[in-house]
C-alpha cells in the first residue's frame, strides 16, 4: 500500500501552501525507501537517494514556480510515482446567511470569505436547539445534527424542510479542501429572518363614477402555506405617473380602495407583506400594477355600501391558494364622508 | 508591494451621495473578501460593511444599512463604498481593508475622510 | 452585536514597565480576537490575531491571551515607540466589533 495519504481531491494530487515548506510523497514505494525526484521533463535531479528523507521530496519556502508534475524513481530506476503538486491556502470560514419565505422552511447560503484556490467542498448540517424549561436561559444539549440538504448542480444552498416556527436552529457550514477544513456557525429563527415573497396577482381597477378612486385587490404570495394560524399584513404604496414620492397605507384585508387618487392620471400600486404579528421584514414590493381613475359619471343609483363590497368575510379555507386574513377592523368604506364633494365636483 | 489605496473623500451636504474607491495592488484582490471601516474624529473603529470576493454576499453595520452600498470589481481589483443620503454622524476617516477569514484584518489603506456638513 | 468593552481606556507607564490591557466581549467569542496598535494620524496595525497569534513582523515584546468572554494583551517591556491606542477587535460574527480602545503614553 501507499506511504502517501490521500487527500481529498482528485487522485495523484498533492498540496502545499505558498511561502511554506511542503513535503511531496512518493506514492509507488514502501515508506522510507529511498527515491530520486525530477520535475516532468527535466533531466536535473532535484533530490537524490542519499538525502536522508526517504521516500518524501522538501521544497522550502514553496511558491507557483514549484506547482507542476513531480517523477520519483527507486534505486534501480523504477518509476515510483508521478505527483502533481498544487498550492493554495487553508479554507477560511465561509459567509452564511439563512432566509425564509414561509414559516415552515428556510434556506441558508454561503460564499467563501476567502479563495483557497484548491477543491473546495462543504459540508452542511444543522441542530435544533430546545429550551430547558421555564428558564429560557438554560438550554439542553441541542437535538441533532442533521444534514442540511443542498440543492443539486452546485448551488451554493441547503434547506431545512419542515422547521418549527419557534425553535431556534445553529447552521453548521464547513468548508473543506485539502489542507483542512473551517466551520462557519450561524444560530437562526425562523421568527428574525422570516420575510414572505410579494403578493402576488395585484390589479388596479377604477370605480365607475368616482374619479378620485382606485380598487387595488391582491392575493396571497403562492409560497405561503395555506393555513389560517400564519397569517399576512399588508402595505400598500400608490403615486401618480411622474410624482416621485409615494403614499403608503396598511389594507385591512387583501384589497384597498384609494381614494385621493389625481383624476385623469395613471396611478402606479406596489404591495409588500408581512407577518401579521410583525415577525421578521416586509417583503420586496410587488411590480407595480397601474390603473387609471374613472372618468364617467355617477350611476344613477348608487348601491348601498354592503352591496358594493366584493369581498365577503369569509373564514380562511384551507384548499384556498390565498386565504383571506379575518379583518382586524372593518372593511374600507367605498363611500364615506367624503363621496359628497367626490359627487358635487362629478356633477358640476 | 501589495497595498490598498483609497479615493473619493471630501465635503458633501447631508442627504448628499458620495462614492468611495479602493485600489487594490501586490495580492490577488478577487481571492478575498473586503471591508470598509470607519474612524470619526477623535474616536474609535467602526465596521461599515463587507462583501466576499464574488461579491455575492454582502454585510453593512446597522448604522448604515439601507443607505450604504458595497461592491468590487474584480477586473479593476477595486473596491467600492456608495453612501447615500449621508448625515453629520457619517463625518469620518474611511479605511479599506483585506481581511483574512472575513474579520482579521491583515492590511489597511491609508484612509481617505469624509465630511458631512452644511 | 456582540459589544466589547476595553480596560482601563488609557494607561500611562514607564519605558521598560509591563503594560496589561483587558477585553471582555458580551457573549463567547471563542477565540476570534484580534488586537490592533493605531498610532495618530495612521491605519490601525494587526498585532495579535486568534487572541494569542503572533502577527508576522510584530516584536515579540506584545503577547495576548484569553479564551470565550475574557481576554489579555500584554507589552512585556514597553518601549517608547509602542505609544499608541490599542483595539481589540471580535470576528466571531459576521458583524465584526471593536472596542473603544485603550491609549497608551509614557511617563
Known amino acids: 500500500s501507499s506511504p502517501c495519504p490521500q487527500a481529498w481531491g482528485p487522485p495523484g494530487v498533492q498540496y502545499g501552501q505558498p511561502g511554506r515548506s511542503v513535503k511531496l510523497c512518493c506514492p509507488g514505494v514502501t515508506a522510507g525507501d529511498p527515491v530520486s525526484w525530477f520535475r516532468d521533463g527535466e533531466p536535473k535531479l532535484l533530490q537524490g537517494p542519499d538525502s536522508g528523507l526517504g521516500h518524501e521530496l522538501v521544497l522550502a519556502q514553496a511558491d507557483s514556480t514549484d506547482e507542476g508534475t513531480y517523477i520519483c524513481q527507486t534505486l534501480d530506476g523504477a518509476l515510483g510515482g508521478t505527483v502533481t503538486l498544487q498550492l493554495g491556502y487553508p479554507p477560511a470560514r465561509p459567509v452564511v446567511s439563512c432566509q425564509a419565505a414561509d414559516y415552515e422552511n428556510f434556506s441558508c447560503t454561503w460564499s467563501p470569505s476567502q479563495i483557497s484556490g484548491l477543491p473546495t467542498r462543504y459540508l452542511t448540517s444543522y441542530r435544533k436547539k430546545t429550551v430547558l424549561g421555564a428558564d429560557s436561559q438554560r438550554r439542553s444539549p441541542s437535538t441533532g445534527p442533521w444534514p442540511c440538504p443542498q440543492d443539486p448542480l452546485g448551488a451554493a444552498r441547503c434547506v431545512v424542510h419542515g422547521a418549527e416556527f419557534w425553535s431556534q436552529y445553529r447552521i453548521n457550514v464547513t468548508e473543506v479542501n485539502p489542507l483542512g477544513a473551517s466551520t462557519r456557525l450561524l444560530d437562526v429563527s425562523l421568527q428574525s429572518i422570516l420575510r414572505p415573497d410579494p403578493p402576488q396577482g395585484l390589479r388596479v381597477e377604477s370605480v365607475p363614477g368616482y374619479p378620485r378612486r382606485l380598487r387595488a385587490s391582491w392575493t396571497y404570495p403562492a409560497s405561503w402555506p395555506c393555513q389560517p394560524h400564519f397569517l399576512l399584513k399588508f402595505r400598500l404604496q400608490y403615486r401618480p405617473a411622474q410624482h416621485p414620492a409615494w403614499s403608503t397605507v396598511e389594507p385591512a384585508g387583501l384589497e384597498e380602495v384609494i381614494t385621493d387618487a389625481v383624476a385623469g392620471l395613471p396611478h402606479a400600486v406596489r404591495v409588500s407583506a408581512r407577518d401579521f404579528l410583525d415577525a421578521g421584514t416586509w417583503s420586496t414590493w410587488s411590480p407595480e400594477a397601474w390603473g387609471t381613475p374613472s372618468t364617467g359619471t355617477i350611476p344613477k343609483e348608487i348601491p348601498a355600501w354592503g352591496q358594493l363590497h366584493t369581498q365577503p368575510e369569509v373564514e380562511p379555507q384551507v384548499d384556498s391558494p390565498a386565504p383571506p386574513r379575518p379583518s382586524l377592523q372593518p372593511h374600507p368604506r367605498l363611500l364615506d364622508h367624503r363621496d359628497s364633494v367626490e359627487q358635487v365636483a362629478v356633477l358640476a | 508591494e501589495v497595498q490598498l489605496l483609497e479615493s473619493g473623500g471630501g465635503l458633501v451636504q447631508p442627504g448628499g451621495s458620495l462614492r468611495l474607491s479602493c485600489a487594490a495592488s501586490?495580492?490577488?484582490?478577487?481571492?478575498?473578501?473586503m471591508t470598509w471601516v470607519r474612524q470619526a474624529p477623535g474616536k474609535g473603529l467602526e465596521w461599515v460593511s463587507s462583501?466576499?470576493?464574488?461579491?455575492?454576499?454582502?454585510q453593512y453595520a446597522d448604522s448604515v444599512k439601507g443607505r450604504f452600498t458595497i461592491s468590487r470589481d474584480n477586473s479593476k481589483n477595486t473596491l467600492y463604498l456608495q453612501m447615500n443620503s449621508l448625515r453629520a454622524e457619517d463625518t469620518a476617516v474611511y479605511y479599506c481593508?483585506?481581511?483574512?477569514?472575513?474579520?482579521?484584518?491583515?492590511?489597511w489603506g491609508r484612509g481617505t475622510l469624509v465630511t458631512v456638513s452644511s | 452585536d456582540i459589544q466589547m468593552t476595553q480596560s482601563p481606556s488609557s494607561l500611562s507607564a514607564s519605558v521598560g514597565d509591563r503594560v496589561t490591557i483587558t477585553c471582555q466581549a458580551s457573549?463567547?467569542?471563542?477565540?476570534?480576537l484580534n488586537w490592533y496598535q493605531q498610532k495618530p494620524g495612521k491605519a490601525p496595525k494587526l498585532l495579535i490575531y486568534?487572541?494569542?497569534n503572533l502577527q508576522t513582523g510584530v516584536p515579540s515584546r506584545f503577547s495576548g491571551s484569553g479564551s470565550g468572554t475574557d481576554f489579555t494583551f500584554t507589552i512585556s517591556s514597553l518601549q517608547p515607540e509602542d505609544i499608541a491606542t490599542y483595539y481589540c477587535?471580535?470576528?466571531?460574527?459576521?458583524?465584526?466589533?471593536f472596542g473603544p480602545g485603550t491609549k497608551v503614553d509614557i511617563k
Open positions: 481593508a483585506k481581511p483574512e477569514d472575513w474579520g482579521m484584518f491583515d492590511l
Open positions: 501586490g495580492f490577488t484582490f478577487s481571492w478575498y473578501s
Open positions: 462583501i466576499v470576493p464574488s461579491g455575492g454576499h454582502t
Open positions: 457573549q463567547d467569542i471563542n477565540n476570534y
Open positions: 486568534d487572541a494569542s
Open positions: 477587535q471580535q470576528y466571531d460574527n459576521l458583524s465584526p466589533t
